[in-house]
């Protein structure tokens, strides 16, 4: 499945992943109760297809976005250039770190997700994107997410 | 198993300086973030400083700033601590993280 069209890097990180915490470096605004697996998608050109559904306010938001590669391995941009993105491997197996800055609700932000192809939680993979967060000058609190694999509007 | 060993603590006159090391082994170092941390008598431990794996990106607490400078060598697994300009409250054990885990720390004492 590994075409030259699509890129190593972008196969790697293809399929289901579990968002597993967050943070930012300011208070965002809607944070999610729940999420469903993060799917992402390669395409060809190198470019990936993100697709998530979050539970926020007892609604149910359906996000895809279209992450589009860069010269740079592991940096993408989305939103028409309004935000970067940068995919990048945790020390622990089977984890990724997604970093990303650009505009939210009109103001400039910067947030890191960790994301894990196993829905249970791993302390080192949670402990190392810690550290990674304050070597970013990431400093709100780490959001735990909770798991669903659909997303029910006015429950879990 | 995750092991992390820091080195080159000392006695130090004010205004003086002194690198730490931590050799990290056990995780693949070059792709795990890794911090400083202090301890001083009586007194909660405190982070110091971060580092991310390639070593872009660092970050300082703000009574370290401009004084401390946090490198690392990933093919040496080992990460840096440069104290320059110490001062008698920079008086702690320092110690090393990486992936949750915690060295044993080194012993820095800054008097006359």
């Known amino acids: 499945q590994d075409t030259p069209a699509l890129g190593k890097d972008t196969v790697a990180v293809s399929g289901k992943w579990y968002l597993k915490a967050m943070t930012a470096d300011q208070e965002v605004p809607e944070k999610p109760d729940s999420v469903t697996p993060m799917i992402l998608k390669a395409q060809k050109g190198g470019n990936l297809e993100a697709k998530i559904t979050m539970l926020t306010n007892g609604q149910c938001q359906n996000i895809t976005v279209v992450l589009h590669k860069t010269s740079e391995p592991g940096k993408y941009t989305a939103y028409e250039g309004q935000r970067v993105v940068f995919i990048q491997p945790s020390p622990v197996r089977d984890h990724y770190i997604l970093y990303c800055e650009g505009e939210l609700h009109g103001r400039q932000i910067r947030m890191a997700k960790l994301l894990g192809r196993d829905p249970e939680q791993s302390q080192e993979a949670l402990e190392d994107f810690r550290e990674f967060s304050r070597a970013k000058g990431l400093n709100q609190e780490i959001l735990e997410l909770a798991q669903s694999e659909t997303c029910s509007p006015g429950g879990q | 198993q995750v092991q992390l060993v820091e080195s080159g603590g000392g006695l130090v006159q004010p205004g003086g300086s002194l690198r730490l090391s931590c050799a990290a082994s056990g995780f693949t170092f070059r792709l795990a973030a890794m911090g400083w941390y202090r301890q001083a008598p009586e007194k909660e431990r405190e982070w110091v400083a971060s580092i991310t794996g390639p070593g872009t990106d660092t970050n300082y607490a703000d009574s370290v700033k401009g004084r401390f400078t946090v490198s690392r060598d990933n093919a040496k697994n080992t990460v840096y601590l440069q104290m320059n300009s110490l001062k008698p409250e920079d008086t702690a054990v320092y110690y090393c993280?990486?992936?949750?885990?915690w060295g044993k720390g080194t012993l820095v004492t800054v008097s006359s």
């Open positions: 993280r990486g992936m949750g885990y």
